[in-house]
Interface confidence: low
C-alpha cells in the first residue's frame, strides 16, 4: 500500500513510510483540539488488494464549549448550530427586554480546552426614566418614576399667560423604546405668531384672521393684469416666519416683452405648491417679508418669553 490516508481531525502516529506491506497496521491519534470518543477504530490495515481498509476520523470530536442555557426572557443562538471552538454564541432578548453583558461569546481554546470568552449576558426588562420636562408644557403620568417598554406619555402646552397661545411643536406622544430611550425628542411649547401677510395688487382668498399662529395657512390670488411670483399658499412655521415666503403680484408686461405672457390671475409661477409637510423638511427661504404696519401687531420677538415654572 502507498501512504495511508490523511484526515482533518486525526493524524498518523509516527512518520509515514513510502509503502507498507500487506497486513501492516497503522494507528492514528486525534489532533490537538480534538478528543477521542470510543468505540470507532482509529487504525487501518493494508489489505491484500493494496488498499487501506476503510477508516474515518469520526471518532475524533472537536473540543466543544459547555452548554449554555437560554437567558431568562431571551435566547442563546449558536452560530452555525455548533458549540465547537472557534465559533460564536449570539444572545438575543425578547421584545421589551435588553441585553446586559456581551451580545456575542466566543468559544475559545484555553490550552486545548474550549471555554466561553465571558459570562453569558442577562436580559433585563426595558425601563425608561421619566421623559424630559418641557418649558410651558407638561406630560401625562408626571408622577410615575419608572416607565416600562412601550409606555407612552402625551405632552400638552400650558394655557398662555398672555393674549397668544402656546403652540406644540413636534409630536405630542412619545413612548419608551427598546433600548430604554424615549422614541423621539420631547416637543416644544412656545408662542408662534407670523406677521400679517400683505400682498400688494393681490388679495387673500382663504385663511382669514387677525392673528396667524403655528400652521396657519393662507391662500392668495393676484388682481387682474398681475401674475403671482411665488407660491399661492403659505404656512406659518415654527420660527414665526411664512413658508414659503409671502408671494408678490407682478404686472403682466406686453407680449413683445421677453417676460412671461399674460396669465390668468389665479395661476402661480411656481410649478408646484408645497404642502406644509413637505416644506417643513426643505431648506428655509432666505427672503423675509417686509414688516407690516398692521395696527397693534407685535413683533414676534415681543411675544411671551418661555419660562419654566
Amino acid at each position: 500500500c502507498e501512504e495511508p490516508p490523511t484526515f482533518e481531525a486525526m493524524e498518523l502516529i509516527g512518520k509515514p513510510k513510502p509503502y507498507y506491506e500487506i497486513g501492516e497496521r497503522v494507528d492514528y491519534k486525534c489532533k490537538k483540539g480534538y478528543f477521542y470518543i470510543p468505540p470507532l477504530a482509529t487504525h487501518t490495515i493494508c489489505d491484500r488488494n493494496h488498499t487501506w481498509l476503510p477508516v474515518s476520523d469520526d471518532a475524533c470530536y472537536r473540543e466543544t464549549c459547555p452548554y449554555i442555557r437560554d437567558p431568562l426572557n431571551g435566547q442563546a443562538v449558536p452560530a452555525n448550530g455548533t458549540y465547537e471552538f472557534g465559533y460564536q454564541m449570539h444572545f438575543i432578548c425578547n421584545e421589551g427586554y435588553y441585553l446586559i453583558g456581551e451580545e456575542i461569546l466566543y468559544c475559545e481554546l484555553k490550552g486545548s480546552v474550549a471555554i466561553w470568552s465571558g459570562k453569558p449576558p442577562i436580559c433585563e426588562k426595558v425601563l425608561c426614566t421619566p421623559p424630559p420636562k418641557i418649558k410651558n408644557g407638561k406630560h401625562t403620568f408626571s408622577e410615575v418614576e419608572v416607565f416600562e417598554y412601550l409606555d407612552a406619555v402625551t405632552y400638552s402646552c400650558d394655557p398662555a399667560p398672555g393674549p397668544d397661545p402656546f403652540s406644540l411643536i413636534g409630536e405630542s406622544t412619545i413612548y419608551c423604546g427598546d433600548n430604554s430611550v424615549w422614541s423621539r425628542a420631547a416637543p416644544e411649547c412656545k408662542v408662534v405668531k407670523c406677521r400679517f401677510p400683505v400682498v400688494e395688487n393681490g388679495k387673500q382668498i382663504s385663511g382669514f384672521g387677525k392673528k396667524f399662529y403655528y400652521k396657519a395657512t393662507v391662500m392668495f390670488e393676484c388682481d387682474k393684469g398681475f401674475y403671482l411670483d411665488g407660491s399661492d399658499t403659505i404656512v406659518c412655521d415654527s420660527n414665526s416666519t411664512w413658508d414659503p415666503p409671502v408671494p408678490k403680484c407682478l404686472k403682466v408686461l406686453p407680449p413683445s416683452s421677453t417676460k412671461p405672457p399674460a396669465l390668468s390671475h389665479s395661476v402661480s409661477t411656481s410649478s408646484t405648491t408645497k404642502s406644509p409637510a413637505s416644506s417643513a423638511s426643505g431648506p428655509r427661504p432666505t427672503y423675509k417679508p417686509p414688516v407690516s404696519n398692521y395696527p397693534g401687531y407685535p413683533k414676534p420677538e415681543e411675544g411671551i418669553l418661555d419660562s419654566l415654572d
Epitope: 482533518e8 489532533k31 490537538k32 483540539g33 452560530a79 452555525n80 471552538f85 472557534g86 465559533y87 460564536q88 466566543y106 481554546l109 484555553k110 490550552g111 486545548s112 480546552v113 470568552s117
Partner: antibody, heavy 122, light 107 residues
C-alpha cells in the same frame, strides 16, 4: 515544514491604509488561530488580536479596534491585516504567529512569520 | 488590561553564570505565562509556556517557575548564544500583554 511567510516592507503615506499578508504552509490552515503582534523600533511587543481561519471569528485588543482589521482567505491559506488611517505611531514591525495547542490547557506561539516592516512617512 | 512588569530591564552576565529574570503581573494570571527570546532583527522565539513547560527543541538550561502574580525565567549556565531580549507574555485574559523586556548581554 510549517511556515508563515509574511509580505515585504511597506512605505506608506500618513492617512493611507496598508494590507499585509501572512501565508501559511505545512499544516491545515483552518485549524489554528493566527495572532498578530506589533513591535515599534526599540520597543516591546504588543498583541493586536487573533483570527480563527475556520470561522473567520476575530478578537481584538481594544487599543487596535478601528485601526486593524483581520481577515483570511482560506483558499490561499493566507491571513491578512489591514491597518487604516496610518500615522507615524503605526510605523513598526508586525509579526504573525500561530497559536499551537500543546495538549489540554496548554498552547503557545510556536511558529512566527519573519516580520513585515511598515514605515509611515510623507 | 493586566500589566506585566519585567526586571531587570537590562543586565550583564558572564558565560557559565546562572541568570534569573522575573516578571510580575498586576493580578493572578493562573500560570498562563510564556517566555520568549528575541535576537536583533529576528522574530521572537518561544522558550517556555504555561509558566514552566519547555518548548520542544529549547535547551534544558532554560527553565521557568512561578505562580499567581510572580514568575521567573532561569538560565542555569549562560552561553554566548543566549544574549538577546527576553519577554514574558500573559495569556490568561484579553488583551494578552507582554512585559517590557529584559536585555541580556555578555560581560
Amino acid at each position: 515544514q510549517i511556515q508563515l511567510q509574511q509580505s515585504g516592507p511597506e512605505l506608506v503615506k500618513p492617512g493611507a491604509s496598508v494590507k499585509i499578508s501572512c501565508k501559511a504552509s505545512g499544516y491545515t490552515f483552518t485549524d489554528y488561530y493566527i495572532n498578530w503582534v506589533k513591535q515599534r523600533p526599540g520597543q516591546g511587543l504588543e498583541w493586536i488580536g487573533w483570527i480563527y481561519p475556520g470561522s473567520g471569528n476575530t478578537r481584538y485588543n481594544e487599543k487596535f479596534k478601528g485601526k486593524a482589521t483581520l481577515t483570511v482567505d482560506t483558499s490561499s491559506s493566507t491571513a491578512y491585516m489591514q491597518l487604516s488611517s496610518l500615522t507615524s505611531e503605526d510605523s513598526a514591525v508586525y509579526f504573525c504567529t500561530r497559536y499551537y495547542y500543546a495538549g489540554r490547557y496548554d498552547w503557545y506561539f510556536d511558529v512566527w512569520g519573519a516580520r513585515t516592516t511598515v514605515t509611515v512617512s510623507s | 488590561g493586566i500589566k506585566m512588569t519585567q526586571s531587570p530591564s537590562s543586565m550583564y552576565a558572564s558565560l557559565g553564570e546562572r541568570v534569573t529574570i522575573t516578571c510580575k503581573a498586576s493580578q493572578d494570571v493562573n500560570s498562563y505565562l510564556s517566555w520568549f527570546q528575541q535576537k536583533p532583527g529576528k522574530s521572537p522565539k518561544t522558550l517556555i509556556y504555561r509558566a514552566n513547560r519547555l518548548v520542544d527543541g529549547v535547551p534544558s538550561r532554560f527553565s521557568g517557575s512561578g505562580s499567581g502574580q510572580d514568575y521567573s525565567l532561569t538560565i542555569s549556565s549562560l552561553e554566548y548564544e543566549d544574549m538577546g531580549i527576553y519577554y514574558c507574555l500573559q495569556y490568561d485574559e484579553f488583551p494578552y500583554t507582554f512585559g517590557g523586556g529584559t536585555k541580556l548581554e555578555i560581560k
